[in-house]
């Protein structure tokens, strides 16, 4: 660490005195101090001398000696007072700039330590400090306003009591700047705009910040627009607003509009798209397939996306049949607005009943006309099976009827013993019927198929089973020949109730 001679923390001299400050270190040393006149600097190897033969109050201050080559960065300091009876203050700067909540040091240095007891801080023209101003004083450094606030941006003077009268320093202007957290906050409304050619439109770009120093502009397809700016201050924020008013829009007004604001922290921008159309439009679409298949008893939501300008004048869901004249309950229909020109309409169909299969249509209307989007809802059913014994063309025949959706496949099984359902160990023969006869196949209804199994002789200690299956499930019917005739019954586990 460098050593200063004289080796005292502070030195008090009179104006006109000769002052010599010598600093010695292991290597080269350097002096730093307040800007002041009359000093002569002489350096020689590891020592450096600051001297003046005519000290003035302006030489008052702290002089620090450092050794640039010292990795520990050690330093030594001495404070010099040049006590001028006419000049109690040496003001090092007439403007101080700090950020809010920082300590603000007003650098009025007392030229005579004896005066410390009678110092005070005032605002210019003798006005008292604002309430809640918390400050302290150091004769070496000046007055510190602690945790300075924006409202304390004022002109201050340091006051010292000399011979019973107050002597003021020159004024020091304090500028307390708002802490700017980032680029200005932006809003651009609307987020999207559609107009028919000839209509009026308005786009508003606004930016706000805690600091007034920011710029905002609106650009159309990368061309900056010349728009008068409205400025305001509320909620402790500065606001700048640009409003673009278009009385009669045309196609050249369409395109991308960007609202851009910038300050020292950076830039923010937000964009919107303006569409100009020739006439009103209404488009309906769905992300779903318009042909829907759902298992009976399950639920379904039908969704329609609507793009429209101008806005919708009416809309509704309608059931077009074929089963009944019931209409969807309004409580099951709901609308959500994605944005100004796009909406989603949903029809909820919980626990679907057989009578609810059919066509559902969403209708919407705006000045562009009516549009409709129709869904076809088919219900899926597991097969229901029945078997009867009959004679066809004189031949004994087992006739199996299976009804379900999608169309069931039919398999016949012959197994030993009397059983409700053939299991693998009992099976004697299996016949697949790849092409059962379709008895009925109407839209939105079950498909009924019939399969015939010609049996020359019914074996009495055997069971004949008709099995039907589709993507939903399966059903079966066991036929047991008995001496008194034939006995048929469905398996106990299959009792279908729609």
């Amino acid at each position: 660490i460098p050593v200063i001679e004289p080796s005292v923390p502070e030195l008090v001299v009179k104006p006109g005195a000769t002052v010599t400050l010598r600093c010695v270190g292991n290597g080269s040393v350097e002096w730093d101090g307040p800007p002041s006149p009359h000093w002569t600097l002489y350096s020689d190897g590891s020592s450096s001398i600051l001297s003046t033969n005519n000290a003035t109050f302006q030489n008052t201050g702290t002089y620090r000696c450092t050794e640039p080559g010292d990795p520990l960065g050690g330093s030594a300091a001495i404070h010099l007072y040049v006590k001028d009876p006419a000049r109690p203050w040496n003001v090092l700067a007439q403007e101080v700039v700090v950020f809010e909540d920082q300590d603000a040091l007003l650098p009025c240095l007392l030229t005579d330590p004896v005066l410390e007891a009678g110092v005070s801080l005032v605002r210019v023209r003798g006005r008292p400090l604002m309430r809640h101003t918390n400050y302290s004083f150091s004769p070496w450094h000046g007055f510190t306003i602690h945790r300075a606030k924006f409202i304390q941006s004022q002109d201050y003077q340091c006051s010292a009591l000399m011979g019973g009268r107050k002597v003021m320093s020159i004024s020091i202007r304090l500028k307390v700047q708002k802490v700017i957290p980032g680029p200005p906050a932006l809003t651009l409304v609307p987020a999207e705009l559609v107009r028919i050619r000839g209509e009026a439109a308005q786009i508003v770009c606004s930016a706000s910040s805690v600091d007034v120093n920011f710029d905002v502009f609106l650009q159309h397809n990368n061309t900056k627009l010349a728009i008068p700016q409205q400025s305001d201050f509320h909620n402790n924020r500065y606001q700048k607003v640009l409003t673009l008013n278009l009385d009669q829009v045309d196609f050249q007004h369409a395109g991308n509009y960007s609202c851009v604001a910038s300050n020292v922290q950076g830039k923010h921008s937000t964009s919107m798209f303006f569409r100009v159309v020739e006439s009103a439009y209404l488009n309906l679409s769905s992300e779903q397939n318009l042909i829907q298949e759902v298992t009976v008893g399950e639920g379904l939501n039908l969704k329609v996306m609507v793009e429209a300008y101008p806005g919708l004048q009416g809309f509704n869901w309608t059931y077009l049949g074929p089963f009944s004249d019931h209409q969807p309950e309004p409580k099951l229909a709901n609308a959500t607005t994605k944005d100004t020109y796009r909406h989603t309409f949903t029809l909820s169909l919980p626990r679907l009943k057989p009578s609810e299969a059919g066509r559902y249509s969403f209708l919407a209307r705006n000045p562009g006309g009516w549009r409709a989007l129709t869904f076809e809802l088919t219900l899926r059913y597991p097969p229901e099976v029945s078997v009867i014994w009959t004679f066809i063309n004189g031949s004994g025949t087992l006739l199996c009827a299976a009804s379900g959706y999608p169309q069931p496949n039919v398999t016949w099984l012959q197994c030993s013993g009397h059983t409700d359902r053939c299991d693998e160990a009992q099976v004697l023969q299996v016949w697949d019927d790849p092409y059962p006869e379709v008895l009925s196949q109407e839209p939105f209804h079950k498909v009924t198929v019939q399969s015939l199994l010609t049996v020359e002789t019914l074996e009495h200690n055997q069971t004949y089973e008709c099995r039907a299956h589709n993507s939903v499930g399966s059903g079966s019917w066991a036929f047991i020949p008995i001496s008194a005739g034939a006995h048929t019954h469905p398996p106990d586990e299959f009792l279908f109730t729609p």
Partner: antibody, heavy 117, light 108 residues
Amino acid sequence: QVQLQESGPGLVKPSETLSLTCTVSGGSISSYYWSWIRQPAGKGLEWIGRIYTSGSTNYNPSLKSRVTMSVDTSKNQFSLKLSSVTAADTAVYYCARDRTFYAFDMWGQGTMVTVSS
Amino acid sequence: EIVLTQSPGTLSLSPGERATLSCRASQSVSSTYLAWYQQRPGQAPRLLIYGASSRATGIPDRFSGSGSGTDFTLTISRLEPEDFAVYYCQQYGSSPYTFGQGTKLEIK
């Protein structure tokens, strides 16, 4: 080794505010004065002003009404704002360490600022 | 403010020659607060001399400064190719700090 680096927009529109930041690396910003100097193309150097790390400032009287300097010791940065700029403010702007007895001993490499619409 | 006037405006010399650059102040400047800078094309100025006669760190001893009051001189004893540049004097003792208009040292 202390290094200084100026940053800010290279293009500013007339009547707007020029904002520049000088970042000090390789050493502390504390306990020194820091100055801004500018140099129009092909011309000499003009001192704009200086700031101490406590926030004390001294400005060139010719620019005083338009200049604000500030310091952020936590980021080792100091800043310059010059308001109501005109084409005459087009220049290379330098930041420098300002030593009471040793002049401007460290300089940034400079940043060109053009004032144009 | 203190006005500094440098002369000559341009100085044409050959490598190896001696260069003498002058700086005159409109009022007395303490020699403690007079500096000289070198600026090469496209670069920032570099401190050569402070306190009228003290060489800054890393500056070759062919550069020397002298003078007091209102007249100051920068001397380059033996010009090297890299010395051809613009030189500015500056006073930093009185606000506002001011620079001379510069002397361009060019190869003859």
